[in-house]
Interface confidence: low
């Protein structure tokens, strides 16, 4: 496939994907559908690390645009080879998508390992966290949380999907980072156009 | 394992105050709220407050409010209990606890005479 | 406040004996969240309290099955089927679902 075309295709995926980090870790802030929760100290620190809103999310949008960009006709120089600039910023974007990426997956991880801060037993804490993640294939305790209501699979299946798709972003950003690499020394396959927008 | 420890006992004049401390061990200090208790013969077992180590919040029993102030040093994983302008009323065995999961210090025993 | 009223006071017992204390709240345990937080706690002489029973019926790790707990609203008792030697000490209700926080006056379980 030409380096422009797997650009755009890439481009694409990361910005859906970005979507996708930045709608869970939304949803991540308002257990079960409640905001009642939101201003209070009753949320895992891993929600507000913003995981899938900073690195899974902006960081990698910018890449998922510079791909976009990249994979559009020629600004700087002329033909085939026009693409050669916004190539080498999609690089330099996907390293740093790249970061965010990791950055959410370990944030989601860790949300997943130590589960959510909770009500159990009149404590609040995070009362899975001795687990090492075992609580994740028990869901009999899952129950044992009592506020917010139904909250482990709420963050279970949020923390899931974020670490799902920080490892799409990780995947999709090193494509792009060897993509574009080989679009800057070789520049695009396309024919050239007359116009160079 | 969870522990809490206390320092076994205090001697203190009529009118100063005191700092009973209270070093949790053996869990995130931050992650759960530590609570303050008094018992005396008297008035048996009644609950002070509560801080939550992470923000810094707190919640007293109406009856000790500007009695007692409760603080906590992330650092050291210790909550502090201040007693102010202390009276022989103030006599007792203080506890911090985990009230809700039956954690309890060994208790410090404050003695207010002259 | 949510008073807690324990009865008896004192409870004289012979080992073996089945003994009973009754809690009774001036508000229901019911928290917002639906649970009851209602413990029962031993206190021996020189000993910080240790928990044997909460939320209205759940025994403590390590806590022997001759202790069970029951009740709902603002009714709780809580049972020994065979009174040990081990036992003897005061008895505290605590709620812990209205602040300020509660305890009974206590139980003093002793011997005839």
């Known amino acids: 496939m030409c380096t422009g075309k797997c650009a755009r295709c890439v481009g694409l995926s990361l910005i859906t994907l970005c979507l996708v980090c930045i709608v869970a870790n939304a949803l991540l802030l308002v257990p079960n559908g409640e905001t009642s929760w939101t201003n209070t100290n009753h949320l895992s620190l891993q929600v507000w690390l913003m995981g899938g809103f900073i690195g899974g999310g902006l960081m990698v949008l910018c890449p998922g645009i510079a791909a976009v960009r990249a994979g559009g006709k020629g600004c700087c120089g002329a033909g085939c080879c026009g693409n050669r600039c916004r190539m080498l910023r999609s690089v330099f974007s996907s390293a740093f998508g790249v970061l965010g990426a990791i950055y959410c997956l370990s944030v989601s991880g860790a949300g997943l390992r130590n589960g959510p801060r909770c009500l159990m037993n009149g404590e609040w804490g995070y009362h899975f966290e001795d687990t090492a993640g075992a609580y994740l294939l028990n869901r009999t305790l899952w129950d044992r949380c009592e506020a917010p209501p139904r909250v482990v699979p709420w963050n279970v299946t949020l923390f899931s999907l974020l670490v799902a798709a920080s490892c799409l972003e990780i995947v999709l950003c090193g494509i792009q980072l060897v993509n574009a690499t080989i679009g800057v020394f070789c520049g695009d396959c396309r024919k050239k156009q007359d116009t160079p927008h | 394992q969870v522990q809490l420890q206390q320092f076994g006992a205090e001697l203190v004049r009529p009118g100063a105050s005191v700092t009973l401390s209270c070093k949790a061990s053996g869990y995130t200090f931050t992650d759960y709220e530590m609570h303050w208790v008094k018992q005396t013969p008297v008035h048996g077992l009644e609950w002070i407050g509560a801080?939550?180590?992470?923000?810094?919040?707190?919640a007293y029993n109406q009856k000790f409010k500007g009695k007692a102030i409760l603080t906590a040093d992330k650092s050291s994983s210790t909550a502090y209990m201040e007693l102010r302008s202390l009276t022989s009323e103030d006599s007792a065995v203080y506890y911090c606890?985990?009230?809700?999961?039956?954690?309890w210090g060994q208790g410090t025993t404050v003695t207010v005479s002259s | 406040d949510a008073v807690v009223t324990q009865t008896p006071l004192s409870l004289p017992v012979s080992l073996g004996d089945q003994a009973s204390i009754s809690c009774r709240s001036s508000q229901s345990l019911v928290h917002s969240n639906g649970n009851t937080y209602l413990h029962w706690y031993l206190q021996k002489p020189g000993q910080s309290p240790k928990l044997l029973i909460y939320?209205?019926?759940n025994r403590f790790s390590g806590v022997p099955d001759r202790f069970s707990g029951s009740g709902s609203g603002t009714d709780f008792t809580l049972k020994i089927s065979r009174v040990e030697a081990e036992d003897l000490g005061v008895y505290y209700c605590?709620?812990?679902?209205?602040?300020?926080?509660?305890f009974g006056a206590g139980t003093k379980l002793e011997l005839k």
């Open positions: 605590f709620q812990g679902s209205h602040i300020p926080l509660t």
């Open positions: 606890t985990r009230p809700y999961l039956g954690y």
């Open positions: 801080i939550d180590p992470e923000t810094g919040g707190t």
């Open positions: 939320k209205v019926s």
